[in-house]
């Protein structure tokens, strides 16, 4: 059974994800940038099921298309050069989702933009955060 | 009405210089990419390059940089494509679009009516 | 350089079905968009992002995407469909766009 000090970690690091990708989000989004529309070229895959930290596996394995896309921004929209940034999400998903056992993710027929795709996974984790509230 | 205006047709002599318009009304030109588009008589279209008149940025098609020149003036909402020594392989039809956001995500949805390009000694 | 590839020609009989492909190495991870060009008109955006369809194109135009390969699909084709279809895409980069080679569909 996990403990409160375990729960009180995950919280922690659902919510530094939660943070990573609400700034990417944000930095895309930003009305001051319009020229980022670029970026809907790229087609991301959505989970068909994110209900659980090991569907964390569907966004581990987007995360190198994810900073391709972000490598078409200019640096100033982010904190972090992009490999960086997708650096610490990836540290934070592979804690999350754990590596005892392997999940193959099922992706739903449906590709999505980057917009899309980032508030998908946005609101994962502010669902999964509330369950351990 | 969101439009683009182009420039009027253009009979030139290879080596000469020419600068073709596109002019947008009815939204905020600055924060919209604007594309060049080939099309030479009874052939496909070809991607030349963009523009985002917002800072200048531009991207050309690898078969067209260096050929022409993509230059915008967003004080007049004005996008250019323009040549320093016209060839008479440069004679098509060259369309100026915009590409969308919103909507129609990177689609171009809104085009110039063609400026008609021709070169001839 | 990048390249997407279409057939030549579609030929279909009024009120059947045409189908149009456009083949690219970049298509599984890039959207593909679709455009009409009418004799001696301007292109017209009729499908974006795969599948979407902008706001005045007829239910008929449709798109898909798997793999390599989008598709554009006309269902119920009327003599006003007859045009020249080009896909548009971009290479792995995202930084240059490409048209494809271009279809013309003959509604007979």
């Known amino acids: 059974a996990p403990t409160s000090s375990s729960t009180k970690k995950t919280q922690l690091q659902l919510e530094h994800l939660l943070l990573d990708l609400q700034m990417i989000l944000n930095g895309i989004n930003n009305y001051k940038n319009p020229k980022l529309t670029r970026m809907l070229t790229f087609k991301f895959y959505m989970p068909k099921k994110a209900t659980e930290l090991k569907h964390l596996q569907c966004l581990e394995e987007e995360l190198k298309p994810l900073e391709e896309v972000l490598n078409l921004a200019q640096s100033k929209n982010f904190h972090l050069r992009p490999r960086d940034l997708i650096s610490n999400i990836n540290v934070i998903v592979l804690e999350l989702k754990g590596s005892e056992t392997t999940f193959m993710c099922e992706y739903a027929d449906e590709t999505a933009t980057i917009v899309e795709f980032l508030n998908r996974w946005i609101t994962f984790c502010q669902s999964i955060i509330s369950t351990l509230t | 009405e969101v439009q683009l205006v182009q420039s009027g047709a253009e009979v030139k002599k290879p080596g000469e210089s020419l600068k073709i318009s596109c002019k947008g009304s009815?939204?905020?030109?600055?924060?919209?990419?604007i594309g060049w588009v080939r099309q030479m008589s009874g052939k496909g279209l070809e991607w030349m390059g963009i523009?985002?008149?917002?800072?200048?940025?531009?991207r050309y098609s690898p078969s067209f940089q260096g050929q022409v020149t993509i230059s915008a003036d967003k004080s007049i909402s004005t996008a250019y494509l323009q040549w320093s020594s016209l060839k008479a392989s440069d004679t098509a039809m060259y369309y100026c679009a915009r590409h969308g956001g919103g909507w129609s995500g990177w689609g171009m949805d809104v085009w110039g009516q063609g400026t008609t390009v021709t070169v001839s000694s | 350089s990048y390249e997407l590839t279409q057939p030549p020609s579609v030929s279909v009989s009024p009120g059947q079905t045409a189908r149009i492909t456009c083949s690219g190495d970049?298509?599984?991870?890039?959207?593909a968009y679709w455009y009409q060009q009418k004799s001696g008109q301007a292109p017209v955006l009729v499908i974006y992002?795969?599948?979407k369809r902008p706001s005045g194109i007829p239910e008929r135009f449709s798109g898909s995407s798997s793999g390599t390969m989008a598709t554009l699909t006309i269902s119920g084709a009327q003599v006003e469909d007859e045009a020249d279809y080009y896909c548009?895409?971009?290479?792995?980069?995202?930084?240059?766009?490409?048209f494809g080679t271009g279809t013309k569909v003959t509604v007979l």
């Open positions: 009815g939204y905020n030109f600055t924060n919209y990419w």
């Open positions: 523009i985002y008149p917002g800072d200048s940025e531009t």
């Open positions: 992002e795969d599948s």
């Open positions: 970049a298509l599984p991870r890039k959207y």
């Open positions: 548009y895409s971009t290479d792995s980069s995202g930084n240059h766009y490409v």
